[in-house]
Amino acid sequence: EVEKTACPSGKKAPEIDESLIFYKKWELEACVDAALLATQMDRVNAIPFTYEQLDVLKHKLDELYPQGYPESVIQHLGYLFLKMSPEDIRKWNVTSLETLKALLEVNKGHEMSPQVATLIDRFVKGRGQLDKDTLDTLTAFYPGYLCSLSPEELSSVPPSSIWAVRPQDLDTCDPRQLDVLYPKARLAFQNMNGSEYFVKIQSFLGGAPTEDLKALSQQNVSMDLATFMKLRTDAVLPLTVAEVQKLLGPHVEGLKAEERHRPVRDWILRQRQDDLDTLGLGLQG
């Protein structure tokens, strides 16, 4: 911590500008007014302050706002956000999506840090649910965000938000997460026609029950093998050979390459050999 010393004559900062990069840490502490800093936070982002200087500026804000920064300051933190600890962020009340975007922008290109995770958690809890605009924003910055949530957290996602989800956002989701998201997606896309519906629901099908897969098999959807391999084993097992053939359409030939992998392996073992032979793929039950 920088010791308290009087500001030298003529060095009191009238504004936050580039001249401050030439101040020593103790001079910043002594000569920069915390209230001035708070009102001119937007300028800090354009000035090449060192790590050490940013520490001093953070310390000044901490002294001014011991209960947590107001959103007017948070929105303009810029690179100073990277200096915040999760404990600092837990004191904040962030309600504006613009503030969230501004801070996520600072961390862009990096993995989700504990600071960012805490910020998002505070923001979502403050809103009460993960609405479409928030989900849009979060998945734009972190495509894997949705799959980082627990099934319990996902349960607060309203079906209307599902429209913001892109296939790549679900790449790392496990079956438990898809179990929660699938019914929401089914509800969100229910008014779409067959082919459009399948395009939208496809990436959520890892959470689909048997009866929905049976229904899809009646719609000439031509599911690809990559999607089929992500289906729940317990949902695939009751499907008949005819239903799987209809579900996969021309992609049915791909079953041969996947015959040793779940869920194909388990499904094959449940079928009568005569039925498997009708596929002409040499599958052995």
Partner: antibody
């Protein structure tokens, strides 16, 4: 050991541009600001500007603003200065110099890059 | 910008002699830094924050001053000290250098 290795000498025509590199090694590149300094044939030194390699933020000497551009490539720990619309006045040796902790002057300097502007 | 005036511009000293060179600022500065440069090489940080010696600098060197008046002193000149010494202020934007004092061996 700390080292700032600069690119080789440049002979350029008036009106052209030049880009000089400075590769840092032996320390964490993003932890210290990088300065650029001009020295015209054996004369004194002129500060061009400074860049924070972590955020890419810059500050320039007003005299060089608009004609000098400072950039960094974090992946290769390299700082650059690009000088545009060169005239004979720009013939000089250009140095990169690391900013010392807590503004304790410029603690490590590159070996310098000679730029000659001549038609 | 702050102008730094170094004097003398050129000086010579015999081995063992005490040497003092000065740097005068057009406005008050918090600290002064000094660099040593030998012909054909890059400058080296020599004295920083007015009076702190950089790593490897012999103890015969010292720096002092405040406000607008600063100086570099060598208590006993040695041959290896022959070089040009530049003062530099880092207190005001932009940082500026003096024109240098060239110290020669007599």
């Amino acid at each position: 050991e700390f080292q700032l290795q600069q690119s080789g000498p440049e002979l350029v025509k008036p009106g052209a541009s030049v880009k000089i590199s400075c590769k840092a090694s032996g320390y964490s590149f993003t932890d210290y600001n990088m300065n650029w300094v001009k020295q015209s044939n054996g004369k004194s030194l002129e500060w061009i500007g400074i860049i924070n390699p972590n955020y890419g933020t810059t500050s320039y000497n007003q005299k060089f603003k608009g004609r000098a551009t400072l950039t960094v490539d974090q992946s290769s720990s390299t700082a650059y200065v690009q000088l545009n619309s060169l005239t004979s006045e720009d013939s000089a040796v250009y140095y990169c110099a690391r900013g010392g902790y807590d503004n304790e002057a410029m603690d490590y300097w590159g070996q310098g890059t000679s730029v000659t502007v001549s038609s | 910008q702050i102008v730094l005036t170094q004097s003398p511009a050129i000086m010579s000293a015999s081995p063992g002699e005490k040497v003092t060179m000065t740097c005068s600022a057009s406005s008050s500065v918090s600290y002064m830094h000094w660099y040593q440069q030998k012909s054909g090489t890059s400058p080296k940080r020599w004295i920083y924050d007015t009076s702190k010696l950089a790593s490897g600098v012999p103890a015969r060197f010292s720096g002092s001053g405040s406000g607008t008046s600063y100086s570099l002193t060598i208590s006993s000149m040695e041959a290896e000290d022959a070089a040009t010494y530049y003062c530099q202020q880092w207190s005001s934007n932009p940082p500026t250098f003096g024109a240098g004092t060239k110290l020669e061996l007599k």
